[in-house]
């Protein structure tokens, strides 16, 4: 099995690792499929792409009847199966099985932390967010290990990407000193972000 | 539905630089490349380069390396290009243009780019 | 870089009539082609997708066709509204380039 791994805003071109001439595509059957469901399939030198890829699908049969996929979903990742099939003596025979593994990588960059005033009064406001990850993330305030209450946060996912975007608010006082980190956990990953706030100096260091 | 807003016309000096934007709405901006092209008047269309504002990650037509910068700001959903040490040959119309799978499928208005003296 | 080529600088059509662009790749490009309409001071118009996938909102009388180096756009039942500049682009390889493009002209 190939194992193919790229990031979402790749492009991914998954090998069949078999050629077939111009000349024996009449006589050849082509399926490529995931995890059983059909993506594409040549008859007779007649392509179908299943509407789920067609947009964004190239069939090369000139580099090893590969496909191509161009706007990678964190749905595309899976196990893909191509099978040749050639007719040889009244019946389509299997001439070749390829398995091609691919992983799509959708990672949330480190998020960004910025803070504002709220006038007339010693509450301050910091917000993070972070957009781009797969799978749907968890977001989480921590001060000394221990998890705050946000005032709210927000999860949205993008249709055609499937990406997330998180974004939360937690308001403090600005009259003691604080540390706090934004957790954002996903699938078994975790990113977070670090807010320092000094009252000496009214200044905070976001921690890089 | 998706629009792509650029920055007005811009009369420059030989020499100097210039920075137009194209902000983008209508869609979830940090998940597509965005696209800057190049057409001088009565001329055809030539790609300068992509952003992905996501992680800022870009791609350069080597004619254009070291002649345009593309940055982005993922806050205000705004892609920006800057253009140095400018010419005559730079006096141009400049495109934004999101791409969906390599495919430059929505375009700005364009931006007017003329140096002069 | 991949030189595409449209050889017609100008076509001239009637209206009712059916039209076809070509646009040559240097090399394979697969499918990885798109077509643009141009009208004068207009931003360019996405039309075709991976050369035979018609964008949202295009006419069903245009169409696009072929695969690695000879594409066609083909207009059928040509409209005035049609006088416009046509660009194809090729999206294989880096950098992406386009046609000189093509420019409509009703009689």
């Known amino acids: 099995v190939i194992h193919v791994t790229k990031e979402v805003k790749e492009v991914a071109t998954l090998s069949c690792g078999h050629n077939v001439s111009v000349e024996e595509l009449a006589q050849t059957r082509i399926y490529w499929q995931k995890e059983k469901k059909m993506v594409l399939t040549m008859m007779s030198g007649d392509m179908n792409i299943w509407p789920e890829y067609k947009n964004r699908t190239i069939f090369d049969i000139t580099n090893n009847l590969s496909i191509v996929i161009l706007a990678l979903r964190p749905s595309d990742e899976g196990t893909y199966e191509c099978v040749v099939l050639k007719y040889e003596k009244d019946a389509f025979k299997r001439e070749h099985l390829a398995e091609v593994t691919l992983s799509v990588k959708a990672d949330f960059p480190t998020p960004s932390i910025s803070d504002f005033e709220i006038p007339t009064s010693n509450i301050r406001r910091i917000i993070c967010s972070t957009s781009g990850g797969f799978p749907e993330p968890h977001l989480s305030w921590l001060e000394n290990g221990e998890e705050l209450n946000a005032i709210n946060t927000t999860v949205s996912q993008d249709p055609e990407t499937e990406l997330y975007a998180v974004s939360s608010k937690l308001d403090f006082n600005m009259t003691t000193n604080h540390s706090f980190m934004c957790l954002i956990k996903y699938g078994h990953l975790r990113v977070n972000q670090t807010f320092n706030w000094n009252t000496t100096k009214q200044e905070h260091f976001p921690d890089n | 539905q998706v629009q792509l807003q650029q920055s007005g016309a811009e009369l420059v000096r030989p020499g100097s630089s210039v920075k137009i934007s194209c902000k983008a709405s209508?869609?979830?901006?940090?998940?597509?490349?965005m696209n800057w092209v190049k057409q001088r008047p009565g001329q055809g269309l030539e790609w300068i380069g992509q952003?992905?504002?996501?992680?800022?990650?870009?791609n350069y037509n080597g004619k254009f390396k070291g002649k345009a910068t593309l940055t982005a700001d993922k806050s205000s959903s705004t892609a920006y290009m800057q253009l140095s040490s400018l010419t005559s040959e730079d006096s141009a119309v400049y495109f934004c243009?999101?791409?969906?799978?390599?495919?430059?499928?929505?375009w700005g208005q364009g931006t007017s780019v003329t140096v002069s003296s | 870089d991949i030189v595409m080529t449209q050889s017609q600088k100008f076509m001239s059509t009637s209206v009712g009539d059916r039209v076809s662009i070509t646009c040559k790749a240097g090399?394979?490009?697969?499918?990885?082609v798109a077509w643009y309409q141009q009208k004068p001071g207009q931003s360019p118009k996405t039309l075709i997708y991976l050369a035979s996938n018609r964008h949202t909102g295009v006419p069903d009388r245009f169409t696009g066709s072929g695969s690695g180096t000879d594409f066609t756009l083909t207009i059928s039942n040509v409209q005035s509204e049609d006088l416009a500049d046509y660009f194809c682009l090729q999206h294989w390889n880096y950098p992406f380039t386009f046609g000189s493009g093509t420019k409509l002209e009703i009689k």
């Open positions: 209508g869609y979830a901006f940090s998940y597509y490349w």
């Open positions: 952003i992905y504002p996501g992680d800022g990650d870009t």
């Open positions: 243009a999101r791409s969906y799978g390599n495919t430059m499928d929505y």
């Open positions: 090399q394979n490009v697969r499918t990885a």
